[in-house]
């Protein structure tokens, strides 16, 4: 058993049928010695008397808010949460496996640049009685500071019969140098509590590996005289690290017909312009990627050929 | 359709082309190592990230773009010793910081070159003959060093008398390649920045 926060405790249980559970001793936070009784949640049934209460915690029915009283007055509370260990592996019931980029990916994180700011998000089908708390650091043995905001509900989607909820959090490394070569990964830790169930999820990454630039901005077409060709031009996104000559991007230019089945013409360039043939009803899209370290491509920025 | 990669004209900053080749070569070598050594801990998540140049060179600090010198987090350990020769410097652009930057890159390359050559000698003794260093990568390191053209003492190749532990050598190779790839990215950024200056 360990303390998650004041008056909230997590009991770690080896979770299998007929498991013996864990013996837990609760102590009433009071100078009083006599006439103390204990109850669980809203029940008025007295579980025991005395300054301490010994309970065997086996199932969720044994978890909850234990309260000690004296003469009708509440003295203190202890909330017990359960953390299930199933065959040596902590349970992951609360969050959905996003399966990208690999199985058992519960937290996904992205950064728009090298400033040390990043966003993480996760999915759940649970809509109520759910709280999250996020901590982060650079490295784990001698951790350096990363400050995270509060997790917020950022999207709701309908998936088949289920509703899916996306939560996200923004974090900022306290003293980040965009040009630094990372040798210690960023660690992100999310505590999730659903009703009386506690779970924790972690992700470890280098900022360089989660970079995903914003799409190029100011995408424009300039027809070339007496030709089916057009000059496409664009600019670096505002959110990208500067100077651009140091933090350079490379670009992919795509000409896509109306039908998804039509052959796509793709051109790769380090410049911020390209000459392509613009077909009727086609659209031109451009996306960006770090020129020197192949992390994710940005989303596409698009304009119609007409 | 891929656009052919533009080759820099001779008037351009002469090291840019070599640094691009370096990054390509080390990335290819790392990919080859990951595939060949699939039963070894060779992914970025599994290895310890060690920098053999730590406390010996200061490439990131010495090569910091001017725009980032205002960022206090980037100024933890700015070096102040200066070396001023090297053929990548167009004379009118010669500056103390630029010379220090390029000499630091040269020292990095020299250190990695020695490590890789020592390691290759060990890998050649492996009866499994599982993996060797790409000669192209070693040649590209050499070319960039020649282009930088700094005078410095030659570092003797380390020789080891004890029987090599091939498992450890292969893990060390992965660690070195990951670190060298990160340094090659920095070198490429620096060359691109200097070329634009």
């Amino acid at each position: 058993i360990w303390e998650l926060k004041k008056d909230v405790y997590v009991v770690e249980l080896d979770w299998y049928p007929d498991a013996p559970g864990e013996m837990v001793v609760l102590t009433c936070d009071t100078p009083e010695e006599d006439g103390i009784t204990w109850t669980l949640d809203q029940s008025s049934e007295v579980l025991g008397s005395g300054k301490t209460l010994t309970i065997q915690v086996k199932e969720f029915g044994d978890a909850g808010q234990y309260t000690c009283h004296k003469g009708g007055e509440v003295l203190s509370h202890s909330l017990l949460l359960l953390h299930k260990k199933e065959d040596g592996i902590w349970s992951t019931d609360i969050l959905k496996d996003q399966k990208e980029p690999k199985n058992k990916t519960f937290l996904r994180c992205e950064a728009k640049n090298y400033s040390g700011r990043f966003t993480c998000w996760w999915l759940t089908t649970i809509s109520t009685d759910l709280t999250f708390s996020v901590k982060s650091s650079r490295g784990s043995s001698d951790p350096q500071g990363v400050t995270c905001g509060a997790a917020t509900l950022s999207a709701e989607r309908v998936r088949g019969d289920n509703k899916e909820y996306e939560y996200s959090v923004e974090c900022q490394e306290d003293s980040a140098c965009p040009a630094a070569e990372e040798s210690l990964p960023i660690e992100v830790m999310v505590d999730a509590v659903h009703k009386l169930k506690y779970e924790n999820y972690t992700s470890s990454f280098f900022i360089r590996d989660i970079i995903k630039p914003d799409p190029p901005k100011n995408l424009q077409l300039k027809p070339l005289k007496n030709s089916r060709q057009v000059e496409v031009s664009w600019e670096y996104p505002d959110t990208w690290s500067t100077p651009h000559s140091y933090f350079s991007l490379t670009f992919c230019v795509q000409v896509q017909g109306k039908s998804k089945r039509e052959k796509k013409d793709r051109v790769f360039t380090d410049k911020t312009s390209a000459t392509v043939i613009c077909r009727k009803n086609a659209s031109i899209s451009v996306r960006a990627q770090d020129r020197y370290y192949s992390s994710s491509w940005s989303e596409w920025a698009s304009v119609p050929c007409s | 359709r891929n656009l052919p990669v533009a080759t820099p004209d001779p008037g351009m900053f002469p090291c840019l082309h070599h640094s691009q080749n370096l990054l390509r070569a080390v990335s290819n070598m790392l990919q080859k190592a990951r595939q060949t050594l699939e039963f070894y801990p060779c992914t970025s998540e599994e290895i310890d990230h060690e920098d053999i140049t730590k406390d010996k060179t200061s490439t990131v600090e010495a090569c910091l773009p001017l725009e980032l010198t205002k960022n206090e987090s980037c100024l933890n350990s700015r070096e102040t010793s200066f070396i001023t020769n090297g053929s990548c410097l167009a004379s009118r652009k010669t500056s103390f910081m630029m010379a220090l930057c390029l000499s630091s890159i040269y020292e990095d390359l020299k250190m990695y070159q020695v490590e890789f050559k020592t390691m290759n000698a060990k890998l050649l003794m492996d009866p499994k003959r599982q993996i060797f260093l790409d000669q192209n990568m070693l040649a590209v390191i050499d070319e960039l060093m020649q282009a930088l053209n700094f005078n410095s003492e030659t570092v003797p190749q380390k020789s080891s008398l004890e029987e090599p532990d091939f498992y450890k050598t292969k893990i060390k190779l992965c660690i070195l390649l990951h670190a060298f790839r990160i340094r090659a990215v920095t070198i490429d950024r620096v060359m691109s920045y200097l070329n634009a200056s």
């Epitope: 080896d14 299998y16 049928p17 260990k85 199933e86 065959d87 592996i89 058992k104 089908t125 | 801990p41």
Partner: antibody
């Protein structure tokens, strides 16, 4: 004490269907994940499928994906394995078992796929 | 499709020490715990070892499990006639959990 009693096995022709049941008692069935494991005659143990305690997630071996469906009825304390498009290579003793560091197995039920 | 490799058979005379190996990889045994089962003919498997080395109550202390790196082993110290059975190791793969990974199985024969 924990008990898992299996039923539903038998002889079936290739291409036909069969449903296995596993009745649980002696524990809070709705709190635990459950597996199906099979063993072809003279062969080793092969995992077939898993279902979460609340039925929200199901996992299958590649060899049965798309043909077998694992399900549970927590109100009846019963686990099921619906097997469709059965093949000769599905012939095996099928076991249900609880998920956890200490597990409990059913007695096994024989499924024979033969023409 | 078995990822965990065991010797097909091992044998010993009563009182001898018999060991069975179970060889896996970094993503399974290297990252997860190992269980060992005993299966007597015509019966369901019985748990002998969980979490690499602990024994459930009721399992004789002549059975012991260990794990090192990407391999595990089961030792029977002072093998007895009633130990003649098939033995299976089991673990998980970190990418496919909760799918159970079973070893290929080992037939233990007690001679004499």
């Amino acid at each position: 004490q924990v008990q898992l009693v299996q039923s539903g096995g038998g002889v079936v022709q290739p291409g036909r269907s069969l449903r296995l049941s596993c009745a649980a008692s002696g524990f809070t069935f709705s709190s635990y994940g459950m597996h199906w494991v099979r063993q072809a005659p003279g062969k080793g143990l092969e995992w077939v499928a898993f279902i979460r305690y609340d039925g929200s997630n199901k996992y299958y071996a590649d060899s049965v994906k798309g043909r077998f469906t694992i399900s549970r009825d927590n109100s009846k304390n019963t686990l099921y394995l619906q097997m469709k498009s059965l093949r000769a290579e599905d012939t095996a003793v099928y076991y249900c078992k609880t998920h956890g560091s200490h597990d409990n197995w059913g007695q096994g039920t024989m499924v024979t796929v033969s023409s | 499709s078995y990822v965990l490799t065991q010797p097909p058979s091992v044998s010993g005379t009563p009182g001898q020490r018999v060991t069975i190996s179970c060889s896996g990889g970094r993503s399974n045994i290297g990252s997860n715990t190992v269980k060992w089962y005993q299966q007597l003919p015509g019966t369901a498997p019985k748990l002998l070892i969980y979490g690499n080395d602990p024994r459930p109550s009721g399992v004789p202390d002549r059975f012991s499990g260990s794990k090192s790196g990407t391999s595990a082993s089961l030792a029977i110290t002072g093998v007895q006639a009633e130990d003649e059975a098939d033995y299976y190791c089991q673990s998980y793969d970190r990418g496919t959990h909760p799918a159970l990974l079973f070893g290929t199985g080992t037939k233990v024969t007690v001679l004499g």
